[in-house]
Interface confidence: low
């Protein structure tokens, strides 16, 4: 596989809508991994440093961003749903992590967090106390 | 799966850091409802998936739409799917 075609994902977490929280007493976080090629990724949610599976739903397979292109880049989405009270607890920390396997070994593309960087391979959010 | 009390809604989400991407969440809809792909190549819509909150014994269907287009709006994100008009919950102007 020509390395010209290897594109790591950009990962972003989107915070729950206040409308959802007030309407359902539940909070859904959405994680988007976009712009990657090839399509070998694994996505996981981590809450307070532990991987979680309950309340998680991830696309069964990545989506071609440009379906007409043979070598289109891919995207993947995942949802994590928790109770409103759990989301509003400021001690709770949520992280979406994507492992990307575009090279010859399996590599975990986790980002160093000591400086602001625009392309993170893990994205995170904190519970909101002020809502 | 059988969704006990479907309560279909579309919510707009915001990124935890400055982000050009707008995300719309379509959730809590009945299993008979299908989510159509967008005819706009700049709007991406996932297939529906089931989420199971085991601790609350609660299951829900969901799909996500997103785009980097500046004029992308959740009210039109799922326009090719049959969604009731009262499904859309606008985002509050002031971010909390």
């Amino acid at each position: 596989e020509d390395l010209k075609k290897v594109f790591p994902p950009k990962v972003a977490v989107f915070e729950p809508s206040e409308a959802e929280i007030s309407h359902t007493q539940k909070a859904t976080l959405v994680c988007l991994a976009t712009g990657f090629y090839p399509d070998h990724v694994e996505l996981s949610w981590w809450v307070n440093g532990k991987e979680v599976h309950s309340g998680v739903s991830t696309d069964p397979q990545p989506l071609k961003e440009q379906p007409a292109l043979e070598d289109s880049r891919y995207s993947l989405s995942s949802r994590l749903r928790v109770s409103a009270t759990f989301w509003h607890n400021p001690r709770n920390h949520f992280r979406c992590q994507v492992q990307f396997y575009g090279l010859s070994e399996d590599d975990e593309w986790t980002e160093d967090r000591d400086k602001p960087i625009t392309q993170k391979i893990s994205a995170e959010a904190w519970g909101r106390a002020d809502c | 799966p059988y969704i006990q009390n479907p309560d279909p809604a579309v919510y707009q989400l915001r990124g935890s850091k400055s982000n050009d991407t707008s995300v719309c969440l379509f959730t809590d809809f009945d299993s008979v409802m299908n989510v159509s792909q967008s005819k706009d190549s700049d709007v991406h819509i996932t297939d529906k998936t089931v989420l199971d909150m085991r601790s609350m014994d609660f299951k829900s269907n969901g799909a996500v739409a997103w785009s980097n287009k500046s004029d992308f709006a959740c009210t039109s994100a799922f326009k090719d799917s049959v969604i009731p008009a009262d499904t859309f919950f606008p985002s509050p102007e002031s971010s909390c």
Epitope: S104, E105, D107, W109, T110 | -
Partner: nanobody, 117 residues
Framework: EVQLVESGGGVVQPGGSLRLSCVAS????????YGWYRQAPGKEREKVAH???????DYADSAKGRFTISRDESKNTVYLQMNSLRPEDTALYYC???????????WGQGTLVTVSS
């Protein structure tokens, strides 16, 4: 950040040999791939050879049987041994590294190889 510095280029007669070196510095522990690329005047940059941290190699058709890519982990250096050089091998040769962290992709400044009689 990762810095790459190439050396070893020069003028050589057809049929001759050269060994190019690429020294990596900085966050080298994050690198999991190295490659050599070349760009001839008026042409697009093209792949010559790749090597992974597992020492798996991959060559362009034009390099197979003549060029060998290798690395010395203790010196953070990648080599390209070029034998049976031809005039069409004349180009600016670049070293490339892929890292586990953003911005992922690093290139050196290049070293010039001229094959001429």
């Amino acid at each position: 950040e990762v810095q790459l510095v190439e050396s070893g280029g020069g003028v050589v007669q057809p049929g001759g040999s050269l060994r190019l070196s690429c020294v990596a510095s900085g966050a080298v522990h994050k690198i999991n791939f190295y490659g050599w690329y070349r760009q001839a005047p008026g042409k697009e940059r093209e792949k010559v050879a790749h090597i992974s941290i597992g020492d798996q190699t991959d060559y362009a058709d034009s390099a197979k049987g003549r060029f060998t890519i290798s690395r010395d982990e203790s010196k953070n250096t990648v080599y390209l041994q070029m034998n049976s050089l031809r005039p069409e091998d004349t180009a600016l040769y670049y070293c490339r590294a892929l890292s586990r962290i953003w911005p992922y992709d690093y290139w050196g400044q290049g070293t010039l190889v001229t094959v001429s009689s």
